[in-house]
Interface confidence: low
């Protein structure tokens, strides 16, 4: 399934700890695109394998 992303509203700028917030249009929910070296639903964990 191809997910279509929108930018998150400004109110969600703090949603992702180490990443960029994107809204999943299909699901109407925020999701995180993690910066390199971070993992987790909100990019909250350092990736020990990175």
């Amino acid at each position: 399934v191809v997910s279509h992303f929108n930018d998150c509203p400004d109110s969600h700028t703090q949603f992702c700890f180490h990443g960029t917030c994107r809204f999943l249009v299909q699901e109407d929910k925020p999701a995180c695109v993690c910066h390199s070296g971070y993992v987790g639903a909100r990019c909250e964990h350092a990736d020990l394998l990175a």
């Epitope: 929108n6 930018d7 509203p9 400004d10 109110s11 249009v25 299909q26 699901e27 109407d28 929910k29």
Partner: antibody
Framework: VQLQQSGAELVRPGASVKLSCTAS????????MYWVKQRPEQGLEWIGR????????KYAPKFQDKATITADTSSNTAYLHLSSLTSEDTAVFYC??????WGQGTLVTVSA | DIQMTQSPSSLSASLGGKVTITCKAS??????IAWYQHKPGKGPRLFIH???KLQPGIPSRFSGSGSGRDYSFSISNLEPEDIATYYC?????????FGGGTKLEIK
């Protein structure tokens, strides 16, 4: 945070009406604005929503041809336009922001 | 779109007692459910979001639980001001849907 809705409307069958919802204490561009319908003695129905930052809208299927949601970020106001009104459209219409903040409702009465 | 079946449609309970309202979704909604209190002449008031998270200012005698398709909302130590209609709302996908509502009365 406050949402102030426009006053009650008495409209003729077949006519249209445009309701307003003006926000204070926040910028409507920051999140979605929603509209909800409640007919007399009935439950709540989700009409749809708009992302005021870009104008993107989404509607419940039953309201697709009935409702049009718009927003004017310069006046911090969201609008609900209802067309081809019938007695089934007699209801209170609520606007909401971020699912948590609600207006006081606008009563629309459709009557000849 | 997702259907939300809320029960009961009305209930009567005693002051100080406990009531539970349930909502069953037509598919898994991943805990994306909110509960509202609605009183005549006012806008609905959000009490709980994401299944169990209480909104600021809502007393702890209100609670929510559930997962998958089945969710519940409970009020303990019922007080006169709890008289209202309560609704569930699923927001798991683009098309939000409310349950049919539960009208709470005090015996």
């Amino acid at each position: 945070v406050q949402l102030q809705q426009s006053g009650a409307e008495l409209v003729r069958p077949g006519a249209s009406v445009k309701l307003s919802c003006t926000a204070s204490g926040f910028n409507i561009k920051d999140d979605y604005m929603y509209w909800v319908k409640q007919r007399p003695e009935q439950g709540l129905e989700w009409i749809g929503r708009i992302d005021p930052a870009n104008g993107n809208t989404k509607y419940a299927p039953k309201f697709q041809d009935k409702a049009t949601i718009t927003a004017d970020t310069s006046s911090n106001t969201a609008y609900l336009h209802l067309s081809s009104l019938t007695s089934e459209d007699t209801a209170v219409f609520y606007c909401a922001y971020r699912r948590a903040y609600w207006g006081q409702g606008t009563l629309v009465t459709v009557s000849a | 779109d997702i259907q939300m079946t809320q029960s009961p449609s009305s209930l009567s309970a005693s002051l100080g007692g406990k009531v539970t309202i349930t909502c069953k979704a037509s598919q898994d909604i991943n805990k994306y459910i909110a509960w509202y209190q609605h009183k005549p002449g006012k806008g609905p008031r959000l009490f709980i979001h994401y299944t169990s998270k209480l909104q600021p200012g809502i007393p702890s005698r209100f609670s929510g639980s559930g997962s998958g398709r089945d969710y519940s909302f409970s009020i303990s130590n019922l007080e006169p001001e709890d008289i209202a209609t309560y609704y569930c709302l699923q927001y798991d996908n683009l098309l939000y849907t409310f349950g049919g509502g539960t009208k709470l009365e005090i015996k």
